[in-house]
Interface confidence: medium
Amino acid sequence: KLLQVSTIAMQQQEKLIQQERALLNFTEWKRSCALQMKYCQAFMQNSLSSAHNSSPCPNNWIQNRESCYYVSEIWSIWHTSQENCLKEGSTLLQIESKEEMDFITGSLRKIKGSYDYWVGLSQDGHSGRWLWQDGSSPSPGLLPAERSQSANQVCGYVKSNSLLSSNCSTWKYFICEKYALRSSV
């Protein structure tokens, strides 16, 4: 009988572990959905507001290929930076390639010099993985240098020609990105 109880207890524990795993997956999925939703809203807002405007990028935004970039002139913490970008129908910069990184760092040198600029990269609290705002992982060559010793949430930023990491609650400039309008001509 004792063996039977022990077996039942082990089965229950296994079930509990599976449920916890499922809950963790669901939480991750929910987080990803929320970000995707914000992303879609930003894209829609950008498309609608730009429909009346013939130029590929709004005033004060820089164009490179299919993207428009806005280099902020104000400081904010990482989360507020993301909110600010969303208000403009954009998101924090997502660097897809070395070419894009080179363009950004080259532009920053011309505009402002070697300040710190938040980008849309943050470290997942559980796994420690770096994730862009759309839930994708950065390519191996675009992982932040481990610079932050922070116990708090860690986010990515660009300085000079490097991608670095810092406590998300520190104040920095930031860079927003949105799709450039395709010319209808």
Epitope: N60, S72, E73, I74, W75, S76, N84, K87, E88
Partner: nanobody, 117 residues
Framework: QVQLVESGGGSVQAGGSLRLSCAAS????????MAWSRQAPGKEREFVAR????????DYADSVKGRFTISRDNAKNTVYLQMNSLKPEDTAIYYC??????????SGQGTQVTVSS
Amino acid sequence: QVQLVESGGGSVQAGGSLRLSCAASGRTISNYDMAWSRQAPGKEREFVARISGSGDRTDYADSVKGRFTISRDNAKNTVYLQMNSLKPEDTAIYYCQIQDFGSPSFSGQGTQVTVSS
């Protein structure tokens, strides 16, 4: 066009205090977050403190926390920076800035603060 004029800078001994003022004209600044930044010789401009439009939220750079206090008087369209326990490393030109995302960054001409040991 908004104009920001900083005043209250000067020379002071380490441990001393100064109160900087930033008077705005041409625009009511009560709707905007405001910030103080500073630039020391040969260094980049750095964030010092920020205050929300209503004045209920403030943030400070780690280097000035507990020593500097940012405040505002919306009726006077003015922002203040009370600087206590000043250190030689606080020597810089101090600028006041409207934190209005999406529009050009308005900043004053700055006021010099010199702290000697």
